[in-house]
């Protein structure tokens, strides 16, 4: 468990001609806020996959009004870091998406209007516990400068925050240079020594004597910048860990605390210290507030700051769900008539009509197939005074109105049931099986056949 931290340094027009003066105007003051989305080791192109490592929303920045004639300054930014807690191991390689949002403070009906100004994405290698890495990204005419790091939450330590360090002996009992993180009270552990000369800012090691480089640095001692691009890492505030322990068997092994909670042993069992927004014996109960940034895709969070008050996400066009986490497939309502192709542009729907049809929804017939249009992108083919439809993939029937069954290929294994849900096929597994496609048997004692069930596995109840 640990926290990914993002510090935004500046956001403003990039260098070169055609740069925008300001996102705000004298007529329409505005303020900025940021959202970060983290994914483990994916390519940044997978924009629709969920923020599996977590997401966070910044506070609103100070109100800014453009002064006519004045040079464009760096825009005022929100205070503080964006913090994304992660509950499991830090993956080392991760993808990020940073969105810059503008909140206009005019007299709009229904409150402030907000719009996405810029979106940058990247894939990086980062060791937990390392120094701040600095980055510059451009999105269109805008430039974003930021730093980021990942740090472990005690008692987790290491470059992946997977090892537990429990200080059980007084520091005075260990000799010079030794740390009290060993499993027995009378044992002390020597700190990990990297290769001599390994850059403390740009290198790290997981084994004694090695020197592995952070993103943007190379060379045997990680002192050579790969290029003068965006990955330079000057010295910044560093998160020093205090030693590591390969844990022996104990009640905290495997960290029973969910949602980033940290585990400490008690004489009889264990105790979880939960991060803000979670509570319960194992931190399994969520009491999320707006302070936790629960609204995705630029959703605006409304609600009290105290843990007992509910929050509501007001979603931007094109998104829905209690956390704005689901993209609305407005085209699934098939608004385009006569086989028109539906395009969801986010702010509006657009129909691209087949030859022979016109109108905002392709409702006007212009040709001989009039009144006999094929639905869902099918093509009308005339012949011998009759017509037939050549249907698009996924549709069938005389007029292409029948949706082809996504379950026809029987994707749910071991007798599981497949359902044609609008969000895609869904499997309900027969008792004794689990997995998105019911591919994993469940042991009779209730444990899965996997070492740990990946997210999204849905167990059938083996006791039935």
């Amino acid at each position: 468990a640990g926290v990914f931290e993002l510090q935004i340094h500046s956001f403003g027009p990039g260098p070169g001609p055609g740069a925008p003066r300001s996102p705000c105007s004298a007529r329409l003051p505005c303020r900025l806020f940021f959202r970060v989305c983290l994914k483990p080791g994916l390519s940044e192109e997978a924009a629709e996959s969920p923020c599996a490592l977590g997401a966070a929303l910044s506070a609103r920045g100070p109100v800014y009004t453009e002064q006519p004639g004045a040079p464009a300054p760096d825009l005022p930014l929100p205070d503080g870091l964006l913090q994304v807690p992660f509950r499991d191991a830090w993956p080392g390689t991760f993808s990020f998406i940073i969105e810059t949002w503008r909140e206009e403070l005019g007299d709009q009906i229904g409150g402030p209007a907000w719009s996405l100004l810029a979106r940058v994405a990247g894939r990086r290698r980062l060791a937990a516990g390392g120094p701040w890495a600095r980055d510059i990204q451009r999105a269109g005419a805008w430039e974003l400068r930021f730093s980021y790091r990942a740090r472990c939450e005690p008692p987790a330590v290491g470059t992946a925050c997977t090892r537990l360090c429990r200080p059980r002996s007084a520091p005075s009992r260990c000799g010079p240079g030794l740390r009290p993180c060993a499993p027995l009270e009378d044992e002390c552990e020597a700190p990990l020594v990297c290769r001599a000369g390994c850059s403390p800012e740009h290198g790290f090691c997981e084994q004694p004597g090695e020197c592995r480089c952070l993103e943007g640095w190379t060379g045997p001692l990680c002192t050579v910048p790969v290029s003068t691009s965006s990955c330079l890492s000057p010295r910044g505030p560093s998160s020093a860990t205090t030693g590591c322990l390969v844990p022996g068997p104990g009640p905290c092994d495997g960290n029973p605390c969910a949602n980033g909670g940290s585990c400490s042993e008690t004489p009889r069992s264990f105790e979880c210290t939960c991060p803000r927004g979670f509570y319960g014996l194992r931190c399994e109960v969520s009491g999320v507030t707006c302070a936790d940034g629960p609204c995705f895709n630029g959703g605006l969070c409304v609600g009290g700051a105290d843990p007992d008050s509910a929050y509501i996400c007001h979603c931007p066009p094109g998104f829905q769900g209690s956390n704005c986490e689901k993209r609305v497939d407005r085209c699934s309502l098939q608004p385009c008539r006569n086989g028109g192709l539906c395009l969801d542009l986010g702010h509006a729907l657009r129909c691209r009509c087949r030859a022979g049809f016109a109108g905002p929804r392709c409702e006007h017939d212009l040709d001989d197939c009039a009144g006999r249009a094929c639905a869902n992108g099918g093509t009308c083919v005339e012949g011998g005074g009759a017509h037939r439809c050549s249907c698009a993939l996924g549709f069938g029937g005389r007029d292409c109105r029948e949706r082809a069954d996504p379950c026809a290929a029987r994707p749910c294994a071991h007798g599981g049931r497949c359902y044609a849900h609008f969000s895609g096929l869904v499997c309900a597994c027969a008792p004794g099986y689990m997995g998105a496609r019911c591919e994993f048997p469940v042991h009779p004692d209730g444990a899965s056949a996997l070492p740990a069930a990946p997210p999204g596995l849905r167990p059938g109840d083996p006791q039935r």
Partner: antibody, heavy 118, light 109 residues
């Protein structure tokens, strides 16, 4: 527009039998759904009776409904519920409903009233 | 499988918050295959929330579902007059079994 319509309800005597029909429009059972029957006695909450899975025709029943109620697929757009040995306690509005994933009923018919009385 | 809803009835002022609880005697399938419905007299139930927390298309965002396993909650923030109705939870269980809760009547004043 996807719709379900129930028919076949009415007055029946105790120990009598009745068959209800659910007719789908705007979609057919060529896709895989649970087509289910749910009843609601006056002033009470809904009560699940049975489902037929259109993917393979398998059926599931509430424990209390086994033996007296039979669900079957009559065509690609109709499902029936045969009810036997009806009692006064079976008086209710009978709904046809569709589960198309995640175990919830996203589409309901308006219901048909079954009255068991002598 | 028995679903118990509390409290009933529940009363709220316009703009207030309503919280309804639903407890299952056993864990629902996948720990989150639980849905919430709103029903008004003479109408079939209408789904509000599916899979414990997902808002059905067209349902106002003031409805929020939460919970997992055996304990679930429906919260209505900023209640409107139109929200006066009876609310039911419904679970889906391993072995393809469905069950409904007993219902909670919500009065908005």
């Amino acid at each position: 527009q996807e719709q379900l319509v129930e028919s076949g309800g009415g007055l029946v005597q105790p120990e009598g039998s009745l068959t209800l029909t659910c007719t789908a429009s705007g979609f057919s059972f060529s896709s895989s759904y649970d087509m289910c029957w749910v009843r609601q006695a006056p002033g009470k909450g809904p009560e699940w009776i049975a489902c037929i899975y259109t993917g393979d025709g398998s059926t599931d029943y509430a424990s209390w409904a086994k033996g007296r109620f039979t669900v079957s697929k009559a065509s690609s757009t109709t499902v029936t519920l045969q009810m036997t040995s009806l009692a006064v306690a079976d008086t209710a509005t009978y709904f046809c409903a569709r589960n198309s994933g995640y175990g919830y009923f996203g589409l309901w018919g308006p219901g048909t009233l079954v009255t068991v009385s002598s | 499988q028995v679903l118990t809803q509390t409290p009933s009835p529940v009363s709220a002022a316009v703009g207030g918050t309503v919280t309804i609880s639903c407890q299952s005697t056993e864990s629902v399938y996948g720990s989150d295959w639980l849905s919430w419905y709103q029903q008004k007299p003479g109408q079939p139930p209408k789904v509000l929330i599916y899979q414990a927390s997902n808002l059905e298309i067209g349902v106002p965002s003031r409805f929020k579902g939460s919970g997992s396993g055996t304990q679930f909650t429906l919260t209505i923030s900023g209640a409107q007059c139109d929200d006066a109705a009876t609310y039911y939870c419904q679970g889906y269980y391993s072995g393809y079994i469905y069950a409904f809760g007993g219902g909670t009547e919500v009065v908005v004043k």
